[in-house]
Structures are given as C-alpha cells and as structure tokens.
C-alpha cells in the first residue's frame, strides 16, 4: 500500500513538475525590466528564451522572436538546450512511469519489470529536474552578471545634459516557476526511486520440500496449491511462496478485457 502511494505521489509530483518546466520554458518573463532605477517608465520590457516583449502603458504588448540562431549568446542557447533536454527526459519518464504504476495492469507484466521501469522513470525525472534547475540557474547567473555590469556602466557618458538610462533586467517569474518545477520533478524522481525498492522482489530462497505421506504422494512446491489436490486449475488462488508478499488482487492471471486500464 505504501509503495503504491509513494509511486503514485511521485508520478503526480513529477507530472506537476514537468508541466511547470514546460510552462517556464514557454514563458516570456525570464528577465523583466528592473524598475528600481526607473520606476516611472511608461514602457515595460521583458524577455524570454524565445522572444522579447514590450508592454506599453496602454496595455499594448509587442513581442519579437529571436529569429537568429547564430547571433544569440551561447549561454542562452545552453539554457534552451538544458530546458528542452529536461522536457524530453521528463516526457519520456512520464510515459515509462505510466506503465510502471502499480495500480495499472498491463498484460502479465512482472513486478520486477515494473520495478525497473519505476527506477528508470525516477532517474529520468531526477535528471530532468536537474536540467531545469541548472538551466534556470545559468540564466539567473547571467542576469546577475549583466545587472552589475550595466549598473557600473549606467552612470557613464553623462558629462553633458543628455542622459542615456540603460535598461537593466532582473529575475522574471519564469525563473521561480522553473526552480520550483525542477525541484518538484526532482522530488518526484526520488519518490519513484524509493517506490522502486518496495516493488523489487526480494531474493528470498525457499527450498522445495517433499513431504512423503503414507497414503498419498503429494509434493508441496513453491508454486502454491498444485499437484493432485484438485486446486491446480484455480489460478486465482493465493500463492504461498513467491518471493515477495502479495495480496490476492495482485496475482497475475490470463489477460482479460479488465486488465487494460
């Protein structure tokens, strides 16, 4: 029960996290104009990974895409790559984890296979979360560097009457969305890895023991209630020794229409 809950929760947390990573990647507010030095501006600038926008006081917003690949800073390209890798890994992880969920039965899939898939998706979520956190952090670092550089340059060239106020940019909403989403994906991945340990069959060796009764020759094997007792055909019966503790509803039977959720 705890394993199912952990796995399910890990999946949901990762799902929210990946949705957040996608949202952050698409958002335009990665960097927003710092209004501390110029709080009276009637034009508000903000930038994303894919385009830069200007919002005028009328509410009119104009966005222009970065229609160049080679002309963009290497750091921006790196951030884009990290976010895309994070999304791709996260999406694959989600796909894998859906089939790994304990509550979903697909054919006669073994628990060991589900455990492996859970671990795989968990690792994918962890890497996905780390990619997002790394991408956002690289961008944030770039902003901080540029912020202080522009602050140093801000008061230069003011010898005459004319002033040129340089636009400085600070952290946008997308950075916080990205950090939180990356963290959630990471947590979800860890939970999936923890759930995997509970799913994996334990290496418990129960030796087959033969009991020779005087009247009958019935061999009790790890397979459960079989041999000549008449229970062999009842595949729904609870198995006694099968490596790990299971409840009746977890016993795999031949696929039926109810097995595919």
């Amino acid at each position: 029960m705890a394993v199912t809950a952990c796995q399910g929760l890990g999946f949901v947390v990762s799902l929210i996290g990946i949705a957040g990573i996608i949202a952050a990647t698409c958002m335009d507010q990665w960097s927003t104009q710092d209004l501390y030095n110029n709080p009276v501006t009637a034009v508000f600038n903000y930038q994303g990974l894919w385009r830069s926008c200007v919002r005028e006081s009328s509410g009119f917003t104009e966005c222009r895409g970065y229609f160049t690949l080679l002309g963009l800073p290497a750091m921006l390209q790196a951030v884009r790559a990290l976010m895309i890798v994070g999304i791709v890994l996260g999406a694959i992880g989600l796909l894998v984890s859906i089939f790994a969920l304990k509550c979903i039965r697909i054919g006669s899939m073994e628990d060991s296979a589900k455990a492996n898939m859970t671990l795989t998706s968990g690792i994918m979520f962890i890497v996905s979360g780390l990619c997002a956190i790394a991408g956002v952090s690289v961008f944030a670092n770039m902003l901080v560097t540029n912020f202080w550089m522009s602050t140093a340059n801000m008061y230069t060239g003011m010898g005459g009457m004319v002033q040129t106020v340089q636009t400085r940019y600070t952290f946008g909403a997308a950075l916080f969305v990205g950090w939180v989403a990356g963290g959630l994906t990471l947590i979800g991945g860890v939970m999936m890895c923890i759930a995997c340990r509970g799913l994996a069959p334990e290496e418990t060796n129960y030796k087959a023991v033969s009991y020779h009764a005087s009247g009958h020759s019935v061999a009790y094997k790890p397979g459960g209630f079989k041999a000549s007792t008449g229970f062999g055909s009842n595949t729904k019966n609870k198995k006694i020794y099968d490596g790990g503790a299971r409840t009746e509803d977890e016993v795999q039977s031949y696929p039926s229409k109810h097995d595919y959720v």
């Epitope: 200007v54 005028e56 009119f60 104009e62």
Partner: antibody, heavy 120, light 113 residues
Amino acid sequence: EVQLVQSGAEVKKPGASVKVSCKASGYTFTSYIMHWVRQAPGQGLEWIGYINPYNDGTKYNEKFKGRVTLTRDKSTSTVYMELSSLRSEDTAVYYCARLGFTTRNAMDYWGQGTLVTVSS
Amino acid sequence: DIVMTQSPDSLAVSLGERATINCKSSQSLLNSGNQKNYLAWYQQKPGQPPKLLIYGASTRESGVPDRFTGSGSGTDFTLTISSVQAEDVAVYYCQNDHSYPFTFGQGTKLEIK
C-alpha cells in the same frame, strides 16, 4: 465615432475645489486609459495624470499629487478630475485625452477642453 | 523629469515651402526592448484641443496628410512639413511618451510669411 465630451466652464475662488467631467462614447470605455492635460492661457501643455477605467488604477504627476483625484463611473462611461486647494495659477483649460492602444503611448483623441478660472 | 526643448519658438514660412521643427529631450526616448522611440508630435490650432500627428517619432497618425514627416532617434527629433499649407498655421508640440510624468515641449508657433 470616438467622442470625449467635457463639462462646461467653471469659475472658482482660491482654496475651493473643482470637478471636471469627461464623458466617453464611440468605443469600449474600460479598454482605454484616460489622461488629463492642462494648458494655462498662452502657455504650453502640462500632464496631470491618468486613470485606467478598467481597474481604477491611477498615476499622477508629482506636482499635483495630493491635490488631484481622478475617478470614473463605468455605468455612465465618464471620468472625473477633481482639483482641490485651487490657486490662481490653476487657471487653465483642462483636457481629457484618450491613450491610443497602438500609438506608442500617445493620446489619439482629446476632449474639447474645460476652462477653469480661479479668481477671488 | 524629462525636459523637452523645442526650436525655434516661432517659425514663419511661405506657402508651399518646407518647415522644420526640432525637439531635443534631456534623456533618450529610445526603448532598448523594441528599438522604438517614444515621442509624439501634436498640432494645436487656436481655440481647439491638440491633435495627434505623429507617434513613435515617425509613424503618421491615420488621416494626417503625408506632408507631415517625423524623424530622429534617441534625443534629437524633427517634424518636417514638406509643403506648408494655410491650414497648417498652428502651434506644434513634441511630447515624451517614454517616462512619467509625460512632458511636452514649450511649443513652436508656425505662421505664414
């Protein structure tokens, strides 16, 4: 057709208050910010402030802060400019002007103006 | 506050001649985000409210004759009337649309010689 119709001329005594109205028609009232600008006789234009009829947000020129209040009545598509503690230098023609949506923050339509005379 | 300075204060030209009005701002009106200049030009005839002629330093408002042209960037702007007509007699104002408080130039009075 966009129209901004302002209230009639006012004569006030120093220290009194005046409330000028500007009724908008021909467009969606809440979609456009309304600015107020004044012009003293024979002088240039001076920006007073603006009101956003959508959310009642306002911004004032520091020069007038504390003395000017901009309000709006959505039901009648009217904006009001109230100026208190009037002095003789407040004698001017007061204009309401609509901020254009795609005009780079420029005012595309203006009211006919309201002359406010402050005299003892 | 951004100070807008117009020159000349008054201008007298003959009908059909070119008129040039200059406007200088104390701070750049060029927005780095979209490389647009936030400056407008207005025409005010006696007893009338101002009328928008040019916005964004160079974009003509709809209905404005094409003899009116705006140019310039950053801190220096120009309004040019290529062939002055009798109905162009008015006071012309430039306006900072970039930062609050919005400020206007002192005005340039155009007369016919």
